[in-house]
């Protein structure tokens, strides 16, 4: 088949914690990213306060964070715990534009969700969220 | 409705699955008023790292 997957919905939004990072200029100063779940799709990084620039795509790595605390989630020695979270938003309607990070609907919803999570997990330790995916309920 | 799936990252040892879910559920009312998002059917689980190729995107709830 022709075509190549691009424009991943994999985005890391962060709360400004001082994680050391391996990033590229396209990362817009985002301190770290999680590799995309698309094996053939670049990772897209974006600050929660700005619109996603779908052209800023690249691969980057999880930083070597250090911590002596016992892990609360299965992981390697990255110093980071990851949690998968799923929920329904019952007062919104899915449409196909939620499959594309360059659309207004996707960006507005991602921004609201990102800001919401920054509010919820204000305590130190929250590094960010990534791999946002929307699907019909 | 819209189902949202995402991955949260925390510093190692700062939070567990139960607390992630509890804090999120406690915020649902404020989410409705502040962001006009009516949230339900919350599910939280650990993500092994590195992520598997299958990942969470194949889940259907």
């Amino acid at each position: 088949a022709s075509g190549s997957a691009s424009g991943s919905a994999s985005t890391l939004v962060h709360n400004g914690t001082s994680a050391r990072a391996t990033t590229t200029p396209a990362s817009k100063s985002t301190p770290f990213s999680i590799p995309s779940h698309h094996s053939d799709t670049p990772t897209t990084l974006a600050s929660h306060s700005t619109k996603t620039d779908a052209s800023s795509t690249h691969h980057s790595s999880v930083p070597p964070l250090t911590s002596s605390n016992h892990s609360t989630s299965p992981q390697l020695s990255t110093g980071v715990s990851f949690f998968f979270l799923s929920f329904h938003i019952s007062n919104l309607q899915f449409n196909s534009s939620l499959e594309d990070p360059s659309t207004d609907y996707y960006q507005e919803l991602q921004r609201d969700i990102s800001e919401m999570f920054l509010q919820i997990y204000k305590q130190g330790g929250f590094l960010g969220l990534s791999n946002i995916k929307f699907r019909p309920g | 409705s819209v189902v949202v799936q995402l991955t949260l990252a925390f510093r190692e040892g700062t939070i567990n699955v139960h607390d992630v879910e509890t804090q999120f559920n406690q915020y649902k009312t404020e989410a409705a008023s502040r962001y006009n998002l009516t949230i339900s059917d919350v599910s939280v689980s650990d993500v092994p790292f590195p992520f598997s190729a299958q990942s969470h995107h194949h889940h259907h709830h």
Epitope: S2, S4, S8, H37, T41, S96, S97, P101 | -
Partner: antibody
Framework: EVQLQQSGAELVRPGSSVKMSCKTS????????INWVKQRPGQGLEWIGY????????EYNEKFKGKATLTSDTTSSTAYMQLSSLTSEDSAIYFC??????????WGQGTLVTVSA | DIQLTQSPSSLSASLGERVSLTCRAS??????LNWLQQEPDGTIKRLIY???SLDSGVPKRFSGSRSGSDYSLTISSLESEDFVDYYC?????????FGGGTKLEIK
């Protein structure tokens, strides 16, 4: 490598129906959308509609409502499009295009439908 | 519906030449525009997504840009396999619509 395999060419009678398929392989995600597009011989492209695989969520171009019906089967990672009450205007190549982090990322090779008495 | 006016409808050019194809949108579509390439056998491949992002595996001689409501696909130095058909596609709002196409022919 992602592949979209569409079903073979169809020669059908006016007034009848035809159902074509679009099978995805080589991709780990089973949740994504499929768009369907029409191209008449020597002409441009027209969007027919969209279905999110494994759900009953669909969107249609008003022009094709009542003409096209989109369905899918998650277990076989296959999307289907049925065209009804066929006329010569429906003679065309029909493409499926799937999402992969963004819309219209991968395209099938097309299914030629010829409506002829 | 959003109209995409694609120009020129056909273009004759020489190997190595730089060419630009244009799509004008009738309404604001932001960056929600793709460029597609169609081979003579019908095969369609996406070249550019979100106005200016190059799909993986697409040669760097292809680039996309925007100026207001005008969207351009530029091929910096034509190669023999580039002489095919090109379409723009907007996905800002349903129904998604395509430009009329540009046939690129060898001079």
């Amino acid at each position: 490598e992602v592949q979209l395999q569409q079903s073979g060419a169809e020669l059908v009678r006016p007034g009848s129906s035809v159902k074509m398929s679009c099978k995805t392989s080589g991709y780990t995600f089973t949740s994504y959308g499929i768009n369907w597009v029409k191209q008449r011989p020597g002409q441009g492209l027209e969007w027919i509609g969209y279905i999110y695989l494994g759900s009953d969520y669909t969107e249609y171009n008003e022009k094709f409502k009542g003409k096209a019906t989109l369905t899918s089967d998650t277990t076989s990672s296959t999307a289907y499009m049925q065209l009804s009450s066929l006329t010569s205007e429906d003679s065309a190549i029909y493409f499926c295009a799937r999402s992969a982090g963004s819309l219209f990322a991968y395209w099938g090779q097309g299914t030629l439908v010829t409506v002829s008495a | 519906d959003i109209q995409l006016t694609q120009s020129p409808s056909s273009l004759s050019a020489s190997l190595g030449e730089r060419v630009s194809l244009t799509c004008r949108a009738s309404q604001d579509i932001g960056i929600t525009l793709n460029w597609l390439q169609q081979e003579p056998d019908g095969t369609i491949k996406r070249l550019i997504y979100a106005t200016s992002s190059l799909d993986s595996g697409v040669p760097k001689r292809f680039s996309g840009s925007r100026s207001g409501s005008d969207y351009s696909l530029t091929i910096s130095s034509l190669e023999s396999e580039d002489f095919v058909d090109y379409y723009c596609l907007q996905y800002a709002s349903s129904p998604y619509t395509f430009g009329g196409g540009t046939k690129l022919e060898i001079k």
